[in-house]
């Protein structure tokens, strides 16, 4: 078998054997080692040497194996847009951020630039669940059969109706998608309103 | 601006190793795009590349005096180093320290030189 | 190793004639990777050109490169007196680097 070409080699054809790795640098038509994450390039490759990569400094950061001169500038989450930070940056990863409780992306350019306010859900609803928080506005669904919601509020969620048996009550009122069941003590007289009802 | 000054002594014996140090003045030797050579001239003769290094490390040696060569760097001193052991009198020379442009704007030429120091090896 | 032979070994010439110098390698080179100095009696060499075309920072107009593969030449249009010194031409394209033997521009 061949032995393996080792950077920096010449190519021909303007590919290089491990393209996460290496990079062809077209004026010399070789191919080049890539510095990793966390590193940057501090010296140019040539035809008899290889790339020389140096650690990014504080607070900057390169996620990729890469030829960039300069390592990126670490970013704050911009409590402004509405962002909050869920890990910090390293040389290696750019400032971790998401929305803020309570809201949603509104923009999004590779990563989310900008949240805004979650709608409230109305009485009788409740947001639908999404896979990723804050990844989009709130759906609002109808609450399932035997359960309600009683606000308007972006985050409350749709509550079972209570079983007035389990408590050692009876029903007064049944509940509604709006609200809960009203139990009294079984001795209890009816209210005004549903004295006609139980007569019937 | 940079400049370069060559210091060592500037007699060896035989067999001794010849050591020179080469101060970088009006800059940093890690400000990055550079590689840090020695080069040498024998009496009334052409140029010789000995080898060069890079702050990080990264040292590259002439194959004919590789296995003789050391080049090394010293950041805190902002200054970087040639060993050349078990010396004859073929290595006697006018040795300089140049700096060997390599950043992303500029070609692998010796950009700048030291003035050189002469070493003579006799007993 | 990539052997550069340069010609002439000395030439003569007059302040305010034009010099032309050659450098010839054993194999072809990328003109990226060679470069022009020269060296005055006692000084250290001083860097001229490189990529084989440009000139180094400072350096007078009335030097010029050219050449590609194996062939190269260093002109300077009208020599003045400053310009009459040893010329080395120098590749990077190969390890070990190397250089020229020289060639020796002297005032007739």
């Known amino acids: 078998s061949q032995p393996q070409a080792v950077p920096p080699y010449a190519s021909e054809n303007q590919t290089c054997r491990d393209q996460e790795k290496e990079y062809y640098e077209p004026q010399h038509r070789i191919c080049c080692s890539r510095c990793p994450p966390g590193t940057y390039v501090s010296a140019k490759c040539s035809r008899i040497r290889d790339t020389v990569c140096a650690t990014c400094a504080e607070n900057s950061y390169n996620e990729h194996w890469n030829y960039l001169t300069i390592c990126q500038l670490c970013r704050p989450c911009d409590p402004v847009m509405g962002l909050e930070e869920i890990a910090p940056c390293t040389s290696k990863r750019k400032t971790q951020c998401r929305c803020q409780p309570g809201m949603f992306c509104a923009a999004w350019a590779l990563e989310c630039t900008h949240c805004e306010l979650l709608s409230d859900c109305p009485p009788g609803t409740e947001a639908e669940l999404k896979d990723e928080v804050g990844k989009g506005n709130n759906h609002c669904v109808p609450c399932k059969a035997g359960h309600f919601q009683n606000t308007s509020s972006p985050s409350a969620r749709c509550q079972p109706h209570t079983r007035c048996e389990n408590q050692g009550l009876v029903e007064a009122a049944p509940g509604t998608a709006q609200s809960d069941t009203t139990c009294k003590n079984p001795l209890e007289p009816l209210p005004p309103e549903m004295s006609g009802t139980m007569l019937m | 601006q940079v400049q370069l000054q060559e210091s060592g002594p500037g007699q060896v014996k035989p067999s001794q190793t010849l050591s020179l140090t080469c101060t970088v003045s009006?800059?940093?030797?890690?400000?990055?795009?550079?590689?840090w050579g020695w080069i040498r001239q024998h009496p009334g003769k052409g140029l010789e590349w000995i080898g060069y290094?890079?702050?990080?490390?990264?040292?590259y040696y002439n194959p004919s005096l590789k296995s003789r060569t050391t080049i090394s760097v010293d950041t805190s001193k902002n200054q970087f180093s040639l060993k050349l052991s078990s010396v004859i009198a073929a290595d006697t020379a006018v040795y300089y320290c140049?700096?060997?442009?390599?950043?992303?704007?500029?070609?692998?030429?010796?950009?700048?030189w030291g003035q050189g120091t002469m070493v003579t090896v006799s007993s | 190793e990539i052997v550069l032979t340069q010609s002439p070994g000395t030439l003569s010439l007059s302040p305010g004639e034009r010099a032309s110098l050659s450098c010839w390698s054993s194999?072809?080179?990328?003109?990226?990777?060679l470069a022009w100095y020269h060296q005055k009696p006692g000084q250290a060499p001083r860097l001229l050109i490189y990529?084989?075309?440009t000139r180094a920072t400072g350096i007078p107009d009335r030097f010029s490169g050219s050449g590609s593969g194996t062939d190269f030449t260093l002109s300077i249009s009208r020599l003045e007196p400053e310009d009459f010194a040893v010329y080395y031409c120098?590749?990077?394209?190969?390890?070990?680097?190397?250089f020229g033997q020289g060639t020796r521009l002297e005032i007739k």
């Open positions: 140049a700096r060997d442009c390599s950043s992303v704007n500029c070609q692998d030429a010796f950009d700048i």
């Open positions: 009006g800059g940093s030797i890690s400000s990055g795009g550079y590689f």
């Open positions: 290094i890079h702050y990080i490390g990264s040292p």
């Open positions: 194999q072809s080179i990328d003109s990226t990777y």
């Open positions: 990529g084989a075309s």
């Open positions: 120098q590749q990077y394209s190969s390890s070990p680097i190397t």
